[in-house]
Interface confidence: medium
């Protein structure tokens, strides 16, 4: 499901004639089962995130909310295609859904791969502005700026994924009974120039879809951690426990993103390098066989994000509880307005409203009064 297609064996006669490649041994029901689990958790989790964000009143939403909503939409659009890929994998790579769905579902996967990565980056940068430079960049974080940034990231994601829409097709590659959904470069490339397309798309997707965003995220969280550490140094010793928890949340975010996407991009990059460096056959074959599992792990990220970004916030949990309770008579004691108030916006993790240290719309005006007491991930 990557942009690239085949660049094994076409290129480098030595590789082709000496390495004993064989048909990929199917994982059976394992990968399809994981895809379906990600689909179920992803639709539920991201659906809850969207519900929580959009049920809050407009004035109580913060700049981060637009990224959180976008991230949830991206992940949601991503995971709804997974039943198709689960079916395809389970049928031992036989695509029964037609060319249009092959193109569209492949395209949606990549639009939303980019979009979700960009959303995480936007959210990280928003956290950076909120925590490290809250005064100087308060205007940058207005809802209008957030909307513009979101529009840009979606357009960029849509454009970056376009090669998938163009080159994906279905084909009975050997006039056998199976139909594959694959990348076909024959309209633009000869065998010799296929390599350039493969490397170009592979390198660009890894650079733009992983290396650059991850570098930005890492940089943002480095400064965030530095700022938090600075704040806690000024506070009393009881703050140490809070500091550890908050820093661990940030570490979890970055590490989870890395753990989910690193294997995919690393294996892909090593494989591309193999055509230049001529890895031993066993290693080349290992990369080929491990790649579907790396893809699977990267897809898991789309159902983890709601848990990582929302479930650390007690208000999100309250909102979920109130939603579950709404349909049950035993919860009638909880007033609707109260539950609505409590779940206002899970990105504003304050126990108080805009107080003396708050600017217009609840923006923080003094660095030293950042309310970490909620230990919420997306604190404003």
């Amino acid at each position: 499901m990557e942009e690239g297609g085949d660049f094994d064996n076409y290129y480098g006669a030595d590789n082709q004639s000496e390495c004993e490649y064989t048909d990929w041994k199917s994982s059976g029901a394992l990968i399809p089962a994981i895809y379906m689990l990600v689909f179920l958790l992803g639709t539920t989790g991201n659906g809850l995130v969207l519900w929580t964000v959009f049920r809050s009143s407009r004035e109580k939403r913060r700049s981060a909310d637009i990224f959180i909503a976008s991230l949830a939409v991206a992940d949601l659009t991503f995971v709804v295609t997974l039943p198709l890929w689960a079916t395809y994998t389970y049928r031992d790579y036989d695509w029964p859904f037609g060319t249009f769905s092959c193109k569209l579902s492949s395209y949606l996967i990549f639009v939303n791969m980019y979009a979700s990565v960009f959303c995480l980056t936007g959210l990280s940068f928003d956290r950076y502005l909120a925590i490290v430079r809250p005064v100087a960049n308060a205007r940058l974080r207005l809802r209008v700026s957030g909307a513009v940034a979101t529009a840009v990231l979606w357009v960029l994601a849509a454009l970056l994924a376009m090669p998938v829409m163009v080159f994906r097709t279905t084909g009975d590659l050997e006039n056998t009974t199976k139909v594959q959904c694959y990348m076909d470069y024959s309209m633009v490339a000869t065998v010799s120039s296929d390599w350039a397309w493969e490397v170009g798309l592979g390198v660009s997707s890894t650079t733009v879809g992983f290396v650059v965003p991850f570098t930005i995220m890492l940089t943002c969280y480095f400064f965030i951690a530095q700022t938090i550490a600075g704040h806690f140094r000024k506070e009393r010793i009881e703050g140490l426990r809070k500091r550890r928890r908050l820093l661990s949340i940030i570490v979890v975010l970055v590490v989870t993103f890395a753990l989910c996407w690193m294997p995919y991009h690393l294996v892909k990059t090593l494989y591309m390098l193999g055509s230049l460096l001529h890895w031993p056959c066993d290693f080349d074959l290992f990369l080929m066989n491990v790649f579907p599992y790396c893809t699977c792990i990267s897809y898991v990220n789309s159902c983890l994000n709601p848990f990582l970004y929302a479930f650390f916030d007690p208000r999100f949990r309250q909102a979920c509880t109130s939603m579950l309770c709404c349909g049950q008579s035993r919860c009638a004691g909880t007033s609707h307005s109260s539950s609505g108030e409590k779940s206002a916006s899970y990105s504003s993790g304050h126990s108080q409203g805009p107080g003396p240290n708050m600017g217009k719309g609840g923006e923080q005006m003094h660095e030293k009064s950042i309310p970490y007491s909620q230990e919420t991930l997306v604190v404003d």
Epitope: D6, N9, Q16, D23, L173, E174, Q180, S186, T190, F291
Partner: antibody
Framework: EVQLVESGGGLVQPGGSLRLSCAAS????????MSWVRQVPGKGLEWVAN????????YYVDSVKGRFTISRDNAKNSLYLQMNSLRAEDTAVYYC??????????????????????WGQGTTVTVSS | DIQMTQSPSSLSVSVGDRVTITCRAS??????LGWYQQKPGKAPKRLIY???SLQSGVPSRFSGSGSGTEFTLTISGLQPEDFATYYC?????????FGQGTKVEIK
């Protein structure tokens, strides 16, 4: 050294049967698709059949479908061609050959056939009364 | 079935000459074509696969090109050991089909 050695050819009457064997050495036989190709003396080459590594997929040219059966024994590093209901037009030199495929890294299940890279010396089958 | 038509069926050339053999497919076969060399009493030997990829150990004077329905094998600077019969093979779909062959003879 990679080697394929065919055996089992000979003279047979029309309607008769023959079983060709191909012994493989010098490579991991179980990792490759294998083919049979024939050549009528003084004429061109004709692909006959091929078989997947585990024997789960087999393909034949229309002229031999229902009469010829390709099979393999990976434990013995051997490929076979069972020929039944033989006709005069089946007279040919039969070559056993190793198939090569390119496999898509990204699109699992997609493979590209690259022809036959190693051939045996051939075994002659003559169908005559 | 895809029909493969080779031309010429034979040609007489001298050592050092440039030789071009053409293979036409009855329908589009992308880049799925190979070239084989066969000497009398010997098994065929693969020269080129996937239109232009050179088999390991094959001299660089052999090259392939083309796409879709028209393909070419070029031998730049024919050597004495190159006098043989050359076949194209489409490996796009089943059944695999060979061209009828081109015999390259000494002038």
């Amino acid at each position: 050294e990679v080697q394929l050695v065919e055996s089992g050819g000979g003279l047979v009457q029309p309607g008769g049967s023959l079983r060709l064997s191909c012994a493989a050495s010098g490579f991991t036989f179980s990792s490759f698709w294998m083919s049979w190709v024939r050549q009528v003396p003084g004429k061109g080459l004709e692909w006959v059949a091929n078989i997947k590594q585990d024997g789960s997929e087999k393909y034949y040219v229309d002229s031999v479908k229902g009469r010829f059966t390709i099979s393999r024994d990976n434990a013995k590093n051997s490929l076979y061609l069972q020929m039944n209901s033989l006709r005069a037009e089946d007279t040919a030199v039969y070559y056993c050959a190793r198939d090569r495929f390119g496999y898509s890294f990204y699109d699992k299940g997609v493979r590209y056939y690259y022809g036959m890279d190693v051939w045996g010396q051939g075994t002659t089958v003559t169908v005559s009364s | 079935d895809i029909q493969m038509t080779q031309s010429p069926s034979s040609l007489s050339v001298s050592v050092g000459d440039r030789v071009t053999i053409t293979c036409r497919a009855s329908q589009g076969i992308r880049n799925d074509l190979g070239w084989y060399q066969q000497k009398p009493g010997k098994a065929p030997k693969r020269l080129i696969y996937a239109t232009s990829s050179l088999q390991s150990g094959v001299p660089s004077r052999f090259s392939g090109s083309g796409s879709g329905t028209e393909f070419t094998l070029t031998i730049s600077g024919l050597q004495p050991e190159d006098f043989a019969t050359y076949y194209c093979l489409q490996h796009n779909s089943y059944p695999r089909t060979f061209g009828q062959g081109t015999k390259v003879e000494i002038k």
